[in-house]
Interface confidence: low
């Protein structure tokens, strides 16, 4: 339904509080370097304007599109050229090119200081002094660091953030109450951001068809009792929601996500038996709950897939009449029968099926040609099964930290050109697959592990895209979305890599390492490990282990010393010399 004023429509739909929060998120995701106060001022101006349009939809400029209104507002920022350089050129363009230009300048790794958590009492005072500003600041800081964060979900995080402070700032032991909650929100937030980044990459780099295929597979696993038509409707609506959010249309996205949650809850009888609890919650919790809901039970006595997709004489006729619908039905039927497969595996199987039909439906005897298509699936299924089995065994043997180290070495040897911080971040996240997924029974391991790895490898891809340094990474990232993980798994040691010059400064440590948290200390050690491999890519596991053990002992010794700094200086020189000797540098 057409509205005279889009801004008034969204303001009325969402209410002032959500409207302001979403505009703040949108602006912070576009102008990631702007100070908080500047963004708040812009948001207030937009909100006041929206209110005039609510009062009179025919008022001046109220008929303009949201992109025009928001873009015009962003382009009023005085320091745009000094702060953002060529992004300022976007302002010379007209919509829709201007918005596309802003989108292209979103930075997945903005040069922003690390968020340092103040003392609990300081945070509680700030929360009580001005709750509204405190929560806005949270939205702003998260949004500017995660420019693709799923905006309606960020409202849910903010609601939990507020609840944590409301509860814990009144508790006897504020820190004991608050810190675990903040840690949980931080970890969940990073995971949520990474998952959404994959959805946006899928839409932006591989198109709507790729995203819809992913959605058909995932929703069919989750709602196996729903009919194909129902799943297709949900996929269409979900695609619209994510297209809007990934495109910066956050008000439309939040509104449409809310409507989708409403539709799902009104039609839960024909969708899933697992939705009842979700649908009793308020909206933000409801939408989150639906997105995370467990798979419904598979209907009993589902017929064999072969009848419709292999044995039927009408396969090529059905395929020719509506290719995407027929492939969608194949994916739906396969996915609802296989909650034990990863989504990316299901998509590989669908791709293999499509390739086979393309070839066979042009052959002299199509049925004879595609009769054995399901046999081609066997190696595709076994490859991730075996890989997960091997890596879970390794994880159980080593524990998370050492498993991460094994992956650090593995990936540094595969793509040594990638920056050390990126290799550390990605390998640490890859290593978390162990504690996240290996505890699951066989039937849940693959969907957990391989779909998680897709999210992590996408982080590598988006970070690498900003400053490309490796043709091999570019190739694995761009050739096929569903084959990224097999592509990286198949990479061997890069024989063309010229080892990095040895730099003693890289291996010089100071007493500040002693006051770091266990996690930060691990990152320091893992950074050193990556640098070692870059200096000596052919180093054996044993050599690297010996050096890392020496390094751990060195840190432990100097952190216990009375004069820590002197210890780090003197013992550090000995360690570097010993390491060079051990590695033959």
């Amino acid at each position: 339904d057409a509205h005279k004023s889009e801004v008034a429509h969204r303001f009325k739909d969402l209410g002032e509080e959500n409207f302001k929060a979403l505009v703040l998120i949108a602006f912070a995701q576009y102008l990631q370097q702007c100070p908080f106060e500047d963004h708040v001022k812009l948001v207030n101006e937009v909100t006041e304007f929206a209110k005039t349009c609510v009062a009179d939809e025919s008022a001046e400029n109220c008929d303009k599109s949201l992109h025009t209104l928001f873009g015009d507002k962003l382009c009023t920022v005085a320091t745009l050229r000094e702060t953002y350089g060529e992004m300022a050129d976007c302002c010379a363009k007209q919509e829709p090119e201007r918005n596309e230009c802003f989108l292209q300048h979103k930075d997945d790794n903005p040069n922003l200081p690390r968020l340092v958590r103040p003392e609990v009492d300081v945070m509680c005072t700030a929360f009580h002094d001005n709750e509204e500003t405190f929560l806005k600041k949270y939205l702003y800081e998260i949004a500017r660091r995660h420019p693709y964060f799923y905006a309606p979900e960020l409202l849910f995080f903010a609601k939990r953030y507020k609840a944590a402070f409301t509860e814990c700032c009144q508790a006897a032991d504020k820190a004991a109450c608050l810190l675990p909650k903040l840690d949980e929100l931080r970890d969940e937030g990073k995971a949520s951001s990474a998952k959404q980044r994959l959805k946006c990459a899928s839409l932006q780099k591989f198109g709507e068809r790729a995203f819809k295929a992913w959605a058909v597979a995932r929703l069919s696993q989750r709602f196996p009792k729903a009919e194909f038509a129902e799943v297709s409707k949900l996929v269409t609506d979900l695609t619209k929601v994510h297209t809007e959010c990934c495109h910066g249309d956050l008000l439309e996205c939040a509104d449409d996500r809310a409507d989708l949650a409403k539709y799902i809850c009104e039609n839960q009888d024909s969708i899933s038996s697992k939705l009842k609890e979700c649908c009793e919650k308020p909206l933000l919790e409801k939408s989150h709950c639906i997105a995370e809901v467990e798979n419904d039970e598979m209907p009993a006595d589902l017929p064999s897939l072969a009848a419709d997709f292999v044995e039927s004489k009408d396969v090529c006729k059905n395929y020719a009449e509506a290719k995407d619908v027929f492939l969608g039905m194949f994916l739906y039927e396969y996915a609802r029968r296989h909650p034990d497969y990863s989504v990316v595996l299901l998509l590989r199987l669908a791709k293999t099926y499509e390739t086979t039909l393309e070839k066979c439906c042009a052959a002299a005897d199509p049925h004879e040609c595609y009769a054995k298509v399901f046999d081609e699936f066997k190696p595709l299924v076994e490859e991730p099964q075996n890989l997960i089995k091997q890596n879970c065994e390794l994880f159980e043997q080593l524990g998370e930290y050492k498993f991460q180290n094994a992956l650090l070495v593995r990936y540094t040897k595969k793509v040594p050109q990638v920056s050390t911080p990126t290799l550390v971040e990605v390998s640490r996240n890859l290593g978390k697959v162990g504690s996240k997924c290996c505890k699951h029974p066989e039937a849940k391991r693959m969907p957990c592990a391989e779909d998680y790895l897709s999210v992590v490898l996408n982080q590598l891809c988006v970070l690498h895209e900003k400053t490309p340094v490796s043709d091999r990474v570019t190739k694995c990232c761009t050739e096929s979305l569903v084959n990224r993980r097999p592509c990286f798994s198949a990479l061997e040691v890069d024989e063309t890599y010229v080892p990095k010059e040895f730099n003693a400064e890289t291996f010089t440590f100071h007493a500040d390492i002693c006051t770091l948290s266990e996690k930060e200390r691990q990152i320091k050690k893992q950074t050193a490990l990556v640098e070692l491999v870059k200096h000596k890519p052919k180093a054996t596991k044993e050599q690297l282990k010996a050096v890392m053990d020496d390094f751990a002992a060195f840190v432990e010794k100097c952190c216990k010393a009375d004069d820590k700094e002197t210890c780090f200086a003197e013992e550090g020189k000995k360690l570097v010399a010993a390491s060079q000797a051990a590695l033959g540098l």
């Epitope: 009325k12 739909d13 969402l14 209410g15 959500n18 609510v54 509104d255 809310a258 409507d259 949650a261 409403k262 609890e277 009793e280 919650k281 308020p282 909206l283 409801k286």
Partner: antibody, heavy 120, light 110 residues
Framework: EVQLVESGGGLVQPGGSLRLSCAVS????????MTWVRQAPGKCLEWIGT?????NTNYANWAKGRFTISKDSTTVYLQMNSLRAEDTAVYYC????????????????WGQGTLVTVSS | DIVMTQSPSTLSASVGDRVTITCQAS??????LAWYQQKPGKAPKLLIY???TVASGVPSRFKGSGSGTEFTLTISSLQPDDFATYYC????????????FGCGTKVEIK
């Protein structure tokens, strides 16, 4: 300004009919469920019925048959037939939370009420 | 049908007191419960929904808790403006009696 204004109340004889109106402004009935609630003098609040965004209605068991809720683009109506003395009350219309941004269940906005007196 | 029982029906308290009102549902309603405040001659005003979510513009001294069949409204420090009647209300969109109100608790000056 977001508001609800009831009208149509007054004195009616037992067995008579009355149609109450609730004019809404500042929001759209296509986005919010609307509910009628009544309160007899000095008594509890009593739910009468609800009309959803799509126009479906749901009534309290005691109200079925005698009370009918309907709506057009900006007004919600309560048609009351075969009125009795015990129907004497202040009648409120109330808005549920936004169908999407909060469940259409808690009643987030109320009109000022209109008094209906059933007496001979 | 769901029946909501509120207690006490009347409560005498002074400014600054901590006040607790309870509401019991005849069957489990999960967290589908709201609390309202009503002053003489006025329409009810929403305070809490979904058992514990504070409605917009409501002071933080109002707190809702509970789930299933037992619910509580607490006013941490009673203010002069808080003397009124408080109602609980269940909502269940799967049931024919979508809404059921308690009969109210009148908070009066001691």
């Amino acid at each position: 300004e977001v508001q609800l204004v009831e009208s149509g109340g007054g004195l009616v004889q037992p067995g008579g009919s009355l149609r109450l109106s609730c004019a809404v402004s500042g929001f759209s009935l296509s986005r919010y469920a609307m509910t009628w609630v009544r309160q007899a003098p000095g008594k509890c609040l009593e739910w009468i019925g609800t009309i959803t965004t799509g126009g479906n209605t749901n009534y309290a068991n005691w109200a079925k048959g005698r009370f009918t809720i309907s709506k057009d683009s900006t007004t919600v109506y309560l048609q009351m037939n075969s009125l009795r003395a015990e129907d004497t009350a202040v009648y409120y219309c109330a808005r549920g939370g936004y169908v999407s941004y909060a469940d259409a269940t808690e009643l987030s906005l109320w009109g000022q009420g209109t008094l209906v007196t059933v007496s001979s | 049908d769901i029946v909501m029982t509120q207690s006490p029906s009347t409560l005498s308290a002074s400014v600054g007191d901590r006040v607790t009102i309870t509401c019991q549902a005849s069957q489990s309603i999960g967290s589908r419960l709201a609390w309202y405040q009503q002053k003489p001659g006025k329409a009810p005003k929403l305070l809490i929904y979904y058992a514990s979510t504070v409605a917009s513009g409501v002071p933080s001294r109002f707190k809702g808790s509970g789930s299933g069949t037992e619910f509580t409204l607490t006013i941490s420090s009673l203010q002069p403006d808080d003397f009124a009647t408080y109602y609980c209300q269940s909502y269940d969109y799967s049931s024919s009696s979508s809404y059921a109100f308690g009969c109210g608790t009148k908070v009066e000056i001691k």
